[in-house]
Interface confidence: low
Amino acid sequence: DTEIKVNPPQDFEIVDPGYLGYLYLQWQPPLSLDHFKECTVEYELKYRNIGSETWKTIITKNLHYKDGFDLNKGIEAKIHTLLPWQCTNGSEVQSSWAETTYWISPQGIPETKVQDMDCVYYNWQYLLCSWKPGIGVLLDTNYNLFYWYEGLDHALQCVDYIKADGQNIGCRFPYLEASDYKDFYICVNGSSENKPIRSSYFTFQLQNIVKPLPPVYLTFTRESSCEIKLKWSIPLGPIPARCFDYEIEIREDDTTLVTATVENETYTLKTTNETRQLCFVVRSKVNIYCSDDGIWSEWSDKQCWEGEDLSKKTLLR
């Protein structure tokens, strides 16, 4: 029996379409596939950012694959051809690996890139990113922010920069249609007359950096002689009620009585007849049903009841 062999894919390359980290891995069929015309050839693709311990592995019949990478580091990938056992009357046959790498030649020393990049998606509506200039740059340095997510034809530059001393230190984004639950790519590069500036790349998903508005319209309602119901309204905006967690802080006569996390817009509190003053504040956060992470809102305005009999039927501000 002659040993069945197959060649690796040809022209394996990583192509950067200018999407700030979303790259195309593409290849052509191997040479000499004539013997296997009745066969569906498969490809095993492995790729990772250089420095990562684990490879991502994909098996596909296609001649391309797309994924997001961290362009602050290089990328390495390898691919080989797989002939399924149905094609070889026996065990699966694999070709040798074809390998390729990709990286953006870094310009400038690391100290010139932006520091402390911070992005917040306020109320799931307004994205704002801010940064500090690199520690090794002069005042003539200016930074530019570009962004892309799937659905945009090409990367867009920020059009509404936040400035300090003439330098761009942040970006207010326009309305970002259909931009959540997918990777959002950002590049902040820079220019200076005196020295090259290192670019920085960032990737996140918008639903994971949401900071909601605080809850509003806090009220008290007496439920029974020893129970008071605290109620509030969800903040306005596109975040549905099912997506909120709340943290309540309740003070009775200047002593912190309760800190609790709840999922609805009510909380029932046991009280005593001796209570003279009751105050509470609430804050909100997107919960695990709608995101993997989030940022607590500011605390609501404090709502207090004092100086009157707490056994009244309804206590409203």
């Epitope: 508005l213 509003v216 306005l236 905006g237 596109p238 305005d301 501000r317």
Partner: antibody, heavy 119, light 111 residues
Framework: QVQLVQSGAEVVKPGASVKVSCKAS????????MNWVRQAPGQGLEWIGR????????HYNQKFKDRVTMTVDTSTSTVYMELSSLRSEDTAVYYC????????????WGQGTLVTVSS | DIQLTQSPSSLSASVGDRVTITCRAS??????????MNWFQQKPGKAPKLLIY???RQGSGDPARFSGSGSGTDFTLTISSLQPEDFATYFC?????????FGGGTKVEIK
């Protein structure tokens, strides 16, 4: 409880100015805008403008832009609205009204100040 | 400026009746998925009271019989079962654009 207490009624002559105050209590003053709304006798409501109690930023109705000035004193949690070059059609009850943000409505109102412009 | 047209300008109704007041804006008052439309109740000699904000959200402590609906340019305030204390004048108000503007009012009287 949230309270907005306005200054008392005024009778002023045409061409003069009036300054109405609105003292807030029972909430974090600088977290809110203060709006001013007027109502002529037997008429509807008319928005004059608003001031951000934190930054002092103002948004005026163009109709009053050249005659109105709104100011804030955070040390006393008081907002002022001054209207100049008064004429008889400025006779109205002037209200201050608290607002958290554009979409939240004016949720607490002062008791109103009657300004009568008469010679 | 955005004009608001309320109808009817007045109506007579009895206790227990279902009352509907409409407000039409000269252009859309929607933005970012929010309708910037509010409803107020005013009794003679008193300051207005917020009933509904953002078209359908109830103000603090308002009775459940008051409800708001609508989006874009057409909005409705409904009182599901009129009570004696509900006889008053009702105003719609937009806060999408400065200057904020009010409807002309609807006076609800006892039949």
């Amino acid at each position: 409880q949230v309270q907005l207490v306005q200054s008392g009624a005024e009778v002023v002559k045409p061409g003069a100015s009036v300054k109405v105050s609105c003292k807030a209590s029972g909430y974090t003053f600088t977290n809110y805008w203060m709006n001013w709304v007027r109502q002529a006798p037997g008429q509807g409501l008319e928005w004059i403008g608003r001031i951000d109690a934190y930054a002092g930023e103002t948004h005026y109705n163009q109709k009053f832009k050249d005659r109105v000035t709104m100011t804030v004193d955070t040390s006393t949690s008081t907002v002022y609205m001054e209207l100049s070059s008064l004429r008889s059609e400025d006779t109205a009850v002037y209200y201050c009204a608290r607002g958290y943000g554009d979409a939240y409505g004016m949720d607490h109102w002062g008791q109103g100040t009657l300004v009568t412009v008469s010679s | 400026d955005i004009q608001l047209t309320q109808s009817p300008s007045s109506l007579s109704a009895s206790v227990g009746d279902r009352v509907t007041i409409t407000c039409r804006a000269s252009e859309s008052v929607d933005n970012y998925g929010i309708s910037f439309m509010n409803w107020f109740q005013q009794k003679p000699g008193k300051a207005p009271k917020l009933l509904i904000y953002a078209a359908s959200r109830q103000g603090s402590g308002d009775p459940a019989r008051f409800s708001g609906s609508g989006s874009g340019t057409d909005f409705t305030l409904t009182i599901s079962s009129l009570q004696p204390e509900d006889f008053a004048t009702y105003f719609c108000q937009q806060s999408k654009e400065v200057p904020w503007t009010f409807g002309g009012g609807t006076k609800v009287e006892i039949k």
